[in-house]
Interface confidence: low
């Protein structure tokens, strides 16, 4: 991270996999040394640390201070650290919830994936990445949203009643849009703007419906940084 | 570019209190802690303690406790040292200190200029 | 708190030439060790951190090495620019704590 630079923010979703996204820009030079190249990440929690002590024996490099006398909140702790011969070592809980692509390792890609991201990941993550002498830094901060889809008014339905699907993330911005679909066997049919469906923003509403609405009904948020969520809902319309 | 510019130099009697100001720009203010270091003339570097900026929570050193206050306004991404008690051998120049780019925390990267108290009857 | 006792306390030397500072930790600290360079009136520049890894920008003269409790920083080949204080650094744990500097002098 270069001086002046602001801290990206990833959002991810609780429960999904999370990808925390590190493509550091290697000199040439130094593109032949990428199948020994270490990497350690290391999280510095937003809240209540998560259970088991920070830092690791076995982790390369500095260990941070545990929390218990120093600051008043969470210390960074080394979460993975992959060495030039692929040793890992981290700390648990996150194990094996958290990976690094092999493949993508290779190619200079030192992403972080989180399988599934859980809420006690949010905060901000560092990642060094050691060629030989020279260090590259990757920095971001994770936010974890939830999401849901709600009905007004909840619970079954009945033939020609009306209802209002709700589709949200915790996320503060709005969507920049939002695409809402019908499950149908394997594939996904759009819904459009119809005299059955009226679409405005993040809601959908369904004026008189039938027995054929029961099953599920999706939408899609997608923001303007690219992150996007699915999310599902089954309506239940009795005959 | 990134960039902590500190108030200017203070001369205090024995007993009284300072207040130093470190402003930081170039970077979001409330995404690193700032720390505050001193050196006491031709000597080494002494660290008083940690202020997080998105909370304002403080942490000490042991030797600083109950004379030491940092705080911080984030409208204005400024940080404030005050050093109450003041005695002549708290006389140095007193830096803030942040690890911007750092991958940990405890050493520091970016460094404001100082600023030199001097305690004196 | 971590003692770092650094050495020697001032060193002349003439352009050109290697120079060697050494820095003992009164306890492991793994490679959590930092080095400064100071100019009078100036604060600090960052160099070296994590033992080994040079800070962006620095030249490739300065270098650093080490772990458990002895480390060693070196300049290659001393430049003009570089007659300055150096400190040595523990970023292990807090609180973090400092060398008391070797000057290095022209000879």
């Known amino acids: 991270l270069q001086p002046g630079a602001e801290v990206p923010v990833v959002w991810a979703q609780e429960g999904a996999p999370a990808q925390l996204p590190c493509s550091p820009t290697i000199p040439l030079q130094d593109l032949s040394l990428l199948r020994r190249a270490g990497v350690t990440w290391q999280h510095q929690p937003d809240s209540g640390p998560p259970a088991a002590a920070p830092g690791h024996p076995l982790a390369p490099g500095p260990h941070p201070a545990a929390p218990s006398s120093w600051g008043p909140r969470p210390r960074r702790y080394t979460v993975l650290s992959v060495g030039p011969g692929g040793l890992r070592s981290g700390r648990l809980p996150l194990q094996p919830r958290v990976q690094l692509d092999e493949r993508g390792r290779q190619r200079g890609d030192f992403s972080l994936w989180l399988r599934p991201a859980r809420r006690a990941d949010a905060g901000e993550y560092r990642a060094a990445v050691h060629l030989r002498d020279r260090a590259l830094s990757c920095r971001l901060r994770l936010r974890l949203g939830q999401a849901s889809m709600t009905a007004s008014p909840p619970g079954s339905l009945r033939a020609s009643d009306w209802v209002i699907l709700n589709c949200s993330f915790s996320r503060p911005d709005r969507p920049a849009s939002v695409h809402w679909f019908r499950n149908r066997g394997q594939g996904r049919v759009p819904v459009r703007e119809s005299p059955h469906h009226h679409l405005a923003e993040s809601f959908l509403f369904l004026p008189q419906v039938s027995p054929m609405d029961s099953g599920p009904w999706g939408c899609i948020l997608t923001y303007r940084d690219g992150f996007n969520v699915s999310i599902m809902y089954n309506l239940t319309v009795l005959g | 570019q990134v960039q902590l510019v500190q108030s200017g130099a203070e001369v205090k009697k024995p007993g009284a209190s300072v207040k130093v100001s470190c402003k930081a720009s170039?970077?979001?203010?409330?995404?690193?802690?700032m720390n505050w270091v001193r050196q006491a003339p031709g000597q080494g570097f002494e660290w008083m303690g940690i202020i997080y900026t998105d909370t304002g929570e403080p942490t000490y050193a042991e030797e600083f406790k109950g004379r030491v206050t940092m705080t911080r306004d984030t409208s204005t991404s400024t940080v404030y040292m005050e050093l109450s008690s003041l005695r002549s051998e708290d006389t140095a120049v007193y830096f803030c200190a942040s690890d911007y780019g750092s991958i940990l925390y405890w050493y520091f990267d970016v460094w404001g200029q100082g600023t030199l108290v001097t305690v004196s009857s | 708190d971590i003692q770092m006792t650094q050495s020697p306390s001032s060193l002349s030397t003439s352009v050109g030439d290697r120079v060697t500072i050494t820095c003992k930790a009164s306890q492991d600290v793994s490679t959590a060790v930092a080095w400064y360079q100071q100019k009078p009136g100036k604060s600090p520049k960052l160099l070296i951190y994590?033992?080994?890894y040079r800070y962006t920008g620095v030249p490739s003269r300065f270098s650093g090495s080490g772990s458990g409790t002895d480390f060693t920083f070196t300049i290659s080949s001393v430049q003009p620019e570089d007659f300055a204080t150096y400190y040595c650094q523990q970023h292990y744990n807090a609180p973090p704590t400092f060398g008391q500097g070797t000057k290095l002098e022209i000879k």
């Open positions: 994590s033992a080994s």
């Open positions: 170039g970077y979001t203010f409330t995404e690193s802690p």
